[in-house]
């Protein structure tokens, strides 16, 4: 798993960054866990990063992710309800220069090294549909969320609002 110090070292550099001309409104480091309190961890294997969903041993350090929050204007002609709306979007970076990406073709969530401006696949619309949990909807594929499948992160299609509360797309953020 990544050491936390490496992430913290580069948060200051990110504060000065501009992604597609927009700066994040706020950033912070948090560990990511599932609704059932399994941890999201990241490991370097064969020169690429793997993402796991697992139970941590007692006193094992949780991996931290840098969440950068962006405000996105949604014009009224797109919103369908006659008002300009704002959404919160996030990018998630567990280590320097690597971001979570939605691979819509493979229905997978991957870590990619990339330079700014980040592609749309790295942006996720933030939902809090459940008390103190969040969900991440693909910017590039509305209705598709980051979810848990077979101890990995995957992209999961949510076909109705009733399923927005399904546990496998709910995540907890913790700064401890």
């Amino acid at each position: 798993a990544f050491g936390i110090s490496g992430v913290q070292k580069y948060t200051r550099a990110l504060h000065d960054s501009s992604i597609t001309g927009i700066s994040p409104i706020t950033e912070y480091l948090a560990s990511l866990s599932t609704y059932n309190d399994q941890s999201i961890t990241f490991a370097l294997e064969d020169e690429s990063y793997e993402i796991y969903v697992e139970d941590l041993k007692k006193d094992e350090k949780k991996d931290k992710v840098l969440l950068s929050y962006y405000e996105s204007q949604h014009p009224s002609n797109e919103s369908g309800d006659g008002v300009d709306g704002k959404m919160l979007m996030v990018t998630l970076s567990p280590t320097k220069d690597f971001w979570l990406h939605a691979n819509n073709k493979e229905h997978s969530v991957e870590l990619h090294k990339c330079e700014k401006p980040l592609p749309d696949q790295a942006f996720f619309v933030l939902h809090n549909m459940h008390s103190n949990c969040v969900s991440f909807e693909c910017k590039t594929d509305p209705g598709v969320f980051i979810g848990v499948k077979d101890n990995h992160l995957a992209l999961i299609k949510v076909d109705s609002s009733e399923n927005l509360c399904t546990e496998n797309i709910l995540f907890k953020l913790s700064e401890t």
């Epitope: 409104i25 706020t26 912070y28 929050y69 405000e71 949604h74 919103s79 369908g80 309800d81 006659g82 008002v83 709306g85 704002k86 959404m87 919160l88 619309v125 933030l126 939902h127 809090n128 549909m129 459940h130 008390s131 103190n132 969040v134 909807e137 609002s161 009733e162 927005l164 509360c165 700064e175």
Partner: antibody
Framework: QVHLKESGPGLVAPSQSLSITCNVS????????VHWIRQTPGRGLDWLGV???????SYNSALMSRLSISEDISKSQVFLKMNDLQTDDSAIYFC???????????????WGQGTLVTVSA | DIQMTQSPASQSASLGESVTITCLAS??????LAWYRQQPGKSPQLLIY???RLADGVPSRFSGSGSGTKFSFKINNLQAEDFVIYYC?????????FGGGTRLEM
């Protein structure tokens, strides 16, 4: 134009229940959460609960056993029901809309005018 | 529940002056803090969200700062309509708690 308006009974007898309707216009309940808040001179502003975009509901745990929030999307209405009212439930009850689509992190951008509820025999 | 401690409870100031109100959260809330003002007989009005962002139509003499547990709200060049009550609110986790309010008096 975003608009929220509460309508309530005004006077409620102790141990009876309270029903308030929040009529909304200018936005979609499928995109924005609607919150219920009450205000008393003694306690200030108290958050009661939220009907989130997508229909899920969160309550203030201190009042959860007495509260029920629901909606009629076709009529653009959100409802608050509170049981077993006591005199200290006398307050101005507000509904308010989230600032952001799909999340409450940005606070409440639009509020109704409030409806005064007095609990008295 | 997260407690929000707002201070001072009341403050006197004069037209054209600046004032600062602080809000302390009992645990870290990131940047998820909003500031409202409430005129007598009216509902609260959102001024600042995400700790530092100015809500639509709010004059730039209002500003917010802070993150984590300590937040500040400043009004420059006080106008007559600013002498009302101000509230902070945390939106990090439910229940979304408010501060006790600050009454600004002339």
């Amino acid at each position: 134009q975003v608009h929220l308006k509460e309508s309530g009974p005004g006077l409620v007898a102790p141990s009876q229940s309270l029903s308030i309707t929040c009529n909304v216009s200018g936005f979609s309940l499928s995109k924005y959460g609607v919150h219920w808040i009450r205000q008393t001179p003694g306690r200030g502003l108290d958050w009661l609960g939220v009907l989130r975009a997508g229909g899920t509901i969160s309550y203030n745990s201190a009042l959860m056993s007495r509260l029920s929030i629901s909606e009629d999307i076709s009529k653009s209405q959100v409802f608050l029901k509170m049981n077993d009212l006591q005199t200290d439930d006398s307050a101005i009850y507000f509904c308010a809309r989230d600032h952001y689509y799909y999340s409450s992190f940005g606070g409440f951008a639009s509020w109704g005018q409030g409806t005064l509820v007095t609990v008295s025999a | 529940d997260i407690q929000m401690t707002q201070s001072p409870a009341s403050q006197s100031a004069s037209l054209g002056e600046s004032v600062t109100i602080t809000c302390l959260a009992s645990q870290t809330i990131g940047a998820w803090l909003a500031w409202y003002r409430q005129q007598p007989g009216k509902s609260p009005q959102l001024l600042i969200y995400a700790a530092t962002r100015l809500a639509d139509g709010v004059p730039s003499r209002f500003s917010g700062s802070g993150s984590g547990t300590k937040f500040s709200f400043k009004i420059n060049n006080l106008q007559a309509e600013d002498f009302v009550i101000y509230y902070c609110q945390q939106l990090n986790s439910t229940p979304y708690t408010f501060g006790g309010g600050t009454r600004l008096e002339m």
